[in-house]
Structure formats: structure tokens, C-alpha cells
Interface confidence: medium
């Protein structure tokens, strides 16, 4: 049943579910592909081309932002497939729990690298000396395992109920969430919206306060400080966090409207929308996971164009690749210019001058 | 537990009508799609209409512009009024209660659930002169 005609006392409603983009849609989504896999590979790159003690501890956050990214890039394909084919999934269950695992994991992941990165510059600017020892790298690794690991167990719950099948009877097999295993007929919809809602709180709500709270304190700090502050040093270090802000402004705009629509869709079931508005809702969805998606090729982009350091790693990187193909030997100060840490105030003043500080202190 | 309770079932007349009611309980009805099919004597259910959680509706090629199918959420029912009745709709006509896929899954009616159990007892309906 392809169509559904919606009858309101007063209006109709023409229902097409899931109305199809198109090529539109897939097309961005193999746009977002191919640069997510090249400029997501490029920063790991260059992150771990890097010597071990010139990377800071915002690194391990950067590096894990870009696995996060290209895990999930790598599915888009699957996605541009079902979304050209009408939502028609012919790659079998297995590829539809995994490549649906992976959106989650993404998700998780991504938010809460960005938390580390806002709470590890919260550290460096608010409160630098008593939180030195947070800032080291065997705390960024404990964070970053432990971050990985909640992600990989919050979207569990996709990996075991998502499936495959024909829902409504047509040829179309529809990759979807299946709570048939854990839910009876009454309850599946209030699993659907209590997975929904609890993913949007702590995919994107939870950390994206957390945030924000960050960049209080950060501002005020800033303030506050301003004229006290060596220029050099505050340089620097606003450098780094004008980066990291471009990074969570720009991931709450992609990921806004998905958890927007997605929550007043879920509301439809207790307030009763009109026919008319879940249609629109229903219709602009996929239009809103897809800005969303393209929130995993941006960082990369928004790294070259707010930070010329990094300009700088790709083009040692990219002058690297021509004088090798020209045959030509390389000194190792020009091996280590095509990092992402030296060149991106990886170790800043204010974290050299801390861990003294540090130190001194003990 | 579900509970459809179909009514309205009867004897009529070729070329007349009949409004079937089908009162709902044990689910969050608005986030349901409901439907109606009908078995005729030695032959397999069949679908008539069904309407989607948002009042979206969809109707077998055999009943277009005969048959309306609508609900309301407030009571919990949905209707299927039939007009210009005909001998081939003589059947058993059962209501079915299917939930709807969340938004991320395409917003489907669950209809491959239909042989999950959310049936009623089935209203005959008879059309003969």
C-alpha cells in the first residue's frame, strides 16, 4: 500500500511514505562519501604522523571524531542505494543492522568526542593549574575508551532489533527497527518512543549542555582575563578553542533538525498533529538525516579553513607526495612539518607552562 | 492485552449499506494503523482498507469509491462505511490493529504483523436480494 489518502473532517491529506528525493539525496549522501573517507583519513593522517609527545591532549579526541566519522561514511553507499531504490534494502539483515549500528555509534561517538574537546579546553582556560594532571595523556586515553565503549553499548539496542521485511506487503523490503522480540503489539510504540527519546537525550541533548556550560565558563573566563593575560598566549590558546566552537556550532546545526522532527513526530502519537503536519514532518525527515549525515565530511573542512596549521600539514603532506613521485629523498624536519599536532599549537604555551607549574608545585 | 470488538455486521441488500465499527483497547491507538479484511466462504482473507495512525487511508482496487474507512482517536474506533454493496462482499469482515514503524524506519504500517494476533471476532456481512 504505496499511498495513503488522509481524511480529516475538514482536509485531506495525500500520504506517500517516505515520498522519494529523487537522486538528490543519494547523491549527496556519495558527495559526503567521498569526502568524508578522504578528509576524515587525511586528519587521522596526519594526527599520528605526529611524534607521540608532540600531541596534546585534545588529539586523542580529534583522532577519535575522525574514526567516528569514517566508520560511518563508509555505510553512506548502502543508504544512497535504499534511498535511490524508494527505501528498498537489497543488501540483507546483516548490513542492516550493522550500517544502522554504525548511524548510532556515529552519533554517540561524535557527541561526545565533542564534549571531551569542549571540557578538555574548559580544563586548559578555566581551570589550568588544578586540573594539569586531567589533561595528561593517559587520562585522554582512559576518556576516549570509555567514550568509545558507552557508544558501542548505547546503540546496541539497534544491532539487535533492527531487520529486515516487507512491512506493508508491497515488493519492498524495508530495512527497520523490529520490537516484536521484546514488545507486544500495545508496547512496541512506547519502545519506539522511549529508544527515541532516550537517544536524542543522551546523543544530543545531554552532551550538547554539557557543551554549552563549557563555553560559559570558557567566555566568562576569557572576560575576565583578558587584559591580565599574556597576548601570545591567549592568542594561541583562542585559537585552538575558536576552532573547537566553529566544530560544536556547526554539529548542533546539522544534528538540530533531525532530533527536532524526530521528537515532534514521536509527540504526534500523544498530541495528535494533523494529517497535514505529520505528512510535512514524514516528508522533510529525510531531508533532515541527510544535513545530519553531513555533519561527518564538515570537520575536516572547517580544520583547513579556521586553522592554518592544519593548511600547513596538508601541504608539507601533499609537497611529501610530489617529491616522492619526482624520486627525491626527505629530511626528516620535513617528515615531521606534515603533522596535524606540530602545526595546530598541539602544545600550546599554556599547556607547556601548566604542567610546569605543575610540577613545581609537587 | 488487545481487544478489537467489531460491530454493525448484518443482512442487507444489493446496492445498500452498512457502517462496521471496530472499538480498540490494550494499545496506543493513535500510533496504530488500523485496518479491515474480509474472508468470503472458502477463501483466504483479503484486504479492504486500512488507515494509517495520522488518518492516511488506502483501500483494495475492489472497494474504491464505495467503501470510506475513518476513525476516531478520541473513542478509540475506527469505521469502514459501505456503500453500494454488492454480492462478492458477502464476508466475514475483520478488524486489524498493526503498529506504525517509527519515522526513522519510513513511518510504515507494520502490515507483514497482521498475522501477529490484533484481530477481532469477525462481523458477518451478508448481501443478497
Known amino acids: 500500500f504505496d499511498n495513503y489518502y488522509g481524511a480529516d473532517n475538514q482536509s485531506e491529506c495525500e500520504y506517500t511514505d517516505w515520498k522519494s528525493s529523487g537522486a538528490l539525496i543519494p547523491a549527496i549522501y556519495m558527495l559526503v562519501f567521498l569526502l568524508g573517507t578522504t578528509g576524515n583519513g587525511l586528519v587521522l593522517w596526519t594526527v599520528f604522523r605526529s611524534s607521540r609527545e608532540k600531541r596534546r591532549s585534545a588529539d586523542i579526541f580529534i583522532a577519535s571524531l575522525a574514526v567516528a566519522d569514517l566508520t560511518f561514511v563508509v555505510t553512506l553507499p548502502l543508504w544512497a542505494t535504499y534511498t535511490y531504490r524508494d527505501y528498498d534494502w537489497p543488501f540483507g539483515t546483516f548490513a542492516c543492522k550493522l550500517s544502522s549500528y554504525l548511524i548510532f555509534v556515529n552519533m554517540y561517538a561524535s557527541a561526545f568526542c565533542l564534549t571531551g574537546l569542549s571540557f578538555d579546553r574548559y580544563l586548559a582556560i578555566v581551570r589550568p593549574v588544578a586540573n594539569a594532571r586531567l589533561r595528561l595523556r593517559v587520562s585522554g586515553a582512559v576518556a576516549t575508551a570509555v567514550l568509545w565503549v558507552l557508544a558501542a553499548l548505547l546503540a546496541m539496542p539497534v544491532m539487535v532489533l533492527r531487520t529486515t521485511g516487507d512491512l506493508e506487503n508491497t515488493t519492498k523490503v524495508q530495512c527497520y527497527m523490529d520490537y516484536s522480540m521484546v514488545a507486544t503489539v500495545s508496547s512496541e510504540w512506547a519502545w519506539e518512543v522511549g529508544l527515541g527519546v532516550s537517544s536524542t537525550t543522551v546523543g544530543f541533548v545531554v552532551p550538547f549542555t554539557i557543551m554549552l556550560t563549557c563555553y560559559f565558563f570558557i567566555a566568562q573566563t576569557i572576560a575576565g582575563h583578558f587584559r591580565k593575560e599574556r597576548i601570545e598566549g591567549l592568542r594561541k590558546r583562542r585559537r585552538l578553542l575558536s576552532i573547537i566552537v566553529v566544530l560544536v556550532v556547526t554539529f548542533a546545526l546539522c544534528k538540530m533538525p533531525y532530533h527536532l522532527v524526530k521528537t515532534l513526530y514521536m509527540l504526534g502519537s500523544l498530541l495528535h498533529w494533523p494529517c497535514d503536519f505529520d505528512l510535512f514532518l514524514m516528508n522533510i525527515f529525510p531531508y533532515c538525516t541527510c544535513i545530519s549525515y553531513v555533519n561527518s565530511c564538515l570537520n575536516p573542512f572547517l580544520y583547513a579553513f579556521f586553522d592554518p596549521r592544519f593548511r600547513q600539514a596538508c601541504t608539507s603532506m601533499l609537497l611529501m607526495g610530489q617529491s616522492r613521485c619526482a624520486g627525491t629523498s626527505h629530511s626528516s624536519s620535513g617528515e615531521k612539518s606534515a603533522s596535524y599536532s606540530s602545526g595546530h599549537d598541539y602544545k600550546d604555551d599554556d599547556d607547556k607552562h601548566h604542567h610546569h607549574h605543575h610540577h613545581h608545585h609537587h | 492485552e488487545v481487544q478489537l470488538v467489531e460491530s454493525g455486521g448484518g443482512l442487507v441488500q444489493p446496492g445498500g449499506s452498512l457502517r462496521l465499527s471496530c472499538a480498540a483497547s490494550?494499545?496506543?491507538?493513535?500510533?496504530?494503523?488500523m485496518g479491515w479484511y474480509r474472508q468470503a466462504p472458502g477463501k483466504g482473507r483479503e484486504f479492504v482498507a486500512a488507515?494509517?495512525?495520522?488518518?492516511?487511508?488506502s483501500y483494495a482496487d475492489s472497494v474504491k469509491g464505495r467503501f470510506t474507512i475513518s476513525r476516531d482517536n478520541s473513542k478509540n474506533t475506527v469505521y469502514l462505511q459501505m456503500n453500494s454493496l454488492r454480492a462478492e462482499d458477502t464476508a466475514v469482515y475483520y478488524c486489524?490493529?498493526?503498529?506504525?514503524?517509527?519515522?526513522?524506519?519510513?513511518?510504515?504500517?507494520?502490515?507483514?504483523?497482521?498475522?501477529?494476533?490484533?484481530w477481532g471476532q469477525g462481523t458477518q456481512v451478508t448481501v443478497s436480494s
Open positions: 490494550g494499545l496506543t491507538f493513535s500510533s496504530h494503523c
Open positions: 486489524a490493529a498493526v503498529p506504525r514503524a517509527g519515522i526513522e524506519s519510513g513511518a510504515y504500517c507494520k502490515w507483514s504483523y497482521k498475522d501477529s494476533g490484533s
Open positions: 488507515i494509517s495512525g495520522s488518518r492516511g487511508y
